[in-house]
Interface confidence: medium
């Protein structure tokens, strides 16, 4: 026996709802970046530490790693920086950048997170000469929730909370479960609304009958977990030419491009340096 099949537009809607947390942080138009900043969403209770991981795929000898908070008006507040093997805190020492033994991963931690720490965060890296490149990670969202002091009761203690990277998993699983539950709910509603479907007459597919491939088959939905984009970048990526006094050294500025794109673009020699007056 088959199960009632819901109309595809409804399934599509449910799937989109199910993917909401990831979808919120997605923009298919933002270029791919080699830097990653995870988890994409993190929820902690006030007073707890909040940790994101900034991953640099290849770490040059000389680089600067910066950690930022982004305001709704696209202003950045640099929280901390890492250069030449030591971390330099910003004006608030609760913000720490720690290099992990892998050398490619950096823990960016807010110690004793406060409610007003909720917001959008990202890391940026500048690879210094001779191979100058600039990268920016996807954005990630931190939510700091208020601690609700519940009166003591006889009820058993709540299960331990997942913090840090476990939160990403919780959010993902929760969103999928919500999607599944909504799908089941819709199926039940449809079964009630269209009793004919429950009798197996035409509306049901046989268990032996696979879904047909081809143009009439159901659309495939993919979710591209990208980064939050409120038209924050001022420009479309193009490597800049240095405006230099002498034509001695050409830096290569790499701007994130889509996966599979040619990668670092060298500076165009015809751009030339910016002449210094004699």
């Amino acid at each position: 026996m088959g199960t009632p099949r819901a109309p595809w537009p409804l399934v599509w809607a449910v799937l989109q709802l199910g993917w909401w947390p990831g979808w919120l942080l997605d923009s298919p138009y933002r270029p791919w970046s080699p830097l990653t900043f995870s988890p994409a969403q993190l929820t902690v209770l006030e007073g707890e530490n909040a940790t994101f991981v900034c991953h640099l795929p290849d770490v040059p000898e000389s680089f600067v790693l910066n950690w930022y908070r982004v305001s709704p008006r696209n202003q950045t507040d640099k929280l901390a920086a890492f250069q030449e093997n030591h971390t330099e805190p910003g004006k608030d020492r609760r913000f720490r950048v720690t290099r992990l033994p892998s050398g490619q991963d950096f823990h960016t931690t807010i110690l004793a997170a406060q409610l007003n720490d909720s917001g959008i965060y990202l890391c940026g890296a500048i690879y210094l000469p001779p191979n100058t490149q600039i990268y920016e990670s996807p954005r990630a969202e931190l939510t700091v929730k208020e601690r609700v002091l519940e009166p003591p009761t006889e009820s058993p203690s709540p299960p331990p909370r997942l913090t840090g990277q476990g939160q990403g998993l919780v959010v993902g699983v929760t969103s999928v479960l919500v999607g599944v539950l909504l799908l089941l709910l819709l199926t039940w509603v449809l079964a009630a609304a269209f009793p004919r479907a429950t009798r197996g007459a035409c509306a049901c597919g046989s268990e032996d009958e696979p879904l047909k491939e081809g143009p009439s088959a159901a659309p495939v939905f993919t979710v591209d977990y990208g980064e939050l984009d409120f038209q924050w970048r001022e420009k479309t990526p193009e490597p800049p030419a240095p405006c230099a006094p002498e034509q001695t050294e050409y830096a290569t500025i790499v701007f994130p491009s889509r996966p599979g794109s040619p990668g670092p673009l060298p500076l165009r020699p015809e751009d030339g340096p910016c002449p210094w007056p004699l």
Partner: antibody, heavy 124, light 107 residues
């Protein structure tokens, strides 16, 4: 080669308006913001603000809100600074400049390419 | 806005001397500091960005260091052509303020 070329010197009376141009060449104009910097005679540098060359949205430092206006003419890769109701204290050299890096939210705003400056003299 | 206090205002040195200029920010600007050189009648030129990184083509006698609120710019061996005014600038937060400048004169 990358260049920012500014318009020539201006001699104005108080209350008049001046419009300075900054013409970019050697790079894609809309890929970098344009910043404006004031230098009064014998004084230091004062950052006035910048304009997003893609959207045309200006950002002004507090001291330059009101009588000052940044604008663009992207078809000719030019940025403009207009000062209305000129005052004696507007007498200065005004520079346009381009930041070192293509504009990314995390880019340093250090300016590696500067126009030659436009001298504005306001005197009755 | 962030105030950049630059010292000294004037320096009179001989060719071959070592020169140090300091800039103090009124609050932490992490490493978002640049140093510029402005020769008489010319526009400024970028020498150092991100506090310690030399810009393309800048001779290695020019160095920068510092983090947070205290920054130093050094010319290890002054040459006659270094006669100029030197400015620091913070590009940590808008408005991107400059120091008052240091005029370097050669004896």
């Amino acid at each position: 080669q990358i260049q920012l070329v500014q318009s020539g010197p201006e001699l104005k009376k108080p209350g008049e308006t001046v419009k300075i141009s900054c013409k970019a060449s050697g790079y894609t104009f809309t890929d970098y913001s344009i910043h404006w910097v004031k230098q009064a005679p014998g004084k230091g540098l004062k950052w006035m603000g910048w304009i997003n060359t893609e959207t045309g949205e200006p950002t002004y430092a507090d001291d330059f809100k009101g009588r000052f206006a940044f604008s663009l003419e992207t078809s000719v890769s030019a940025a403009f600074l207009q000062i209305n109701n000129l005052k004696n204290e507007d007498t200065a050299t005004y520079f346009c400049a381009r930041p070192l890096f293509y504009y990314y939210i995390t880019s340093p705003r250090s300016m590696d390419c500067w126009g030659q400056g436009t001298s504005v003299s306001v005197s009755s | 806005s962030i105030v950049m206090t630059q010292t000294p205002k004037f320096l009179l040195v001989s060719a071959g001397d070592r020169v140090t200029i300091t800039c103090k920010a009124s609050q932490s600007v992490t490493n978002d500091v640049a140093w510029y050189q402005q020769k008489p009648g010319q526009s400024p030129k970028l020498l150092i960005y991100y506090a310690s990184n030399r810009y393309t083509g800048v001779p290695d006698r020019f160095t920068g260091s510092g983090y947070g609120t205290d920054f130093t710019f050094t010319i290890s061996t002054v040459q006659a052509e270094d006669l100029a005014v030197y400015f620091c600038q913070q590009d940590y937060s808008s408005p991107y303020t400059f120091g008052g400048g240091t005029m370097l004169e050669i004896k």
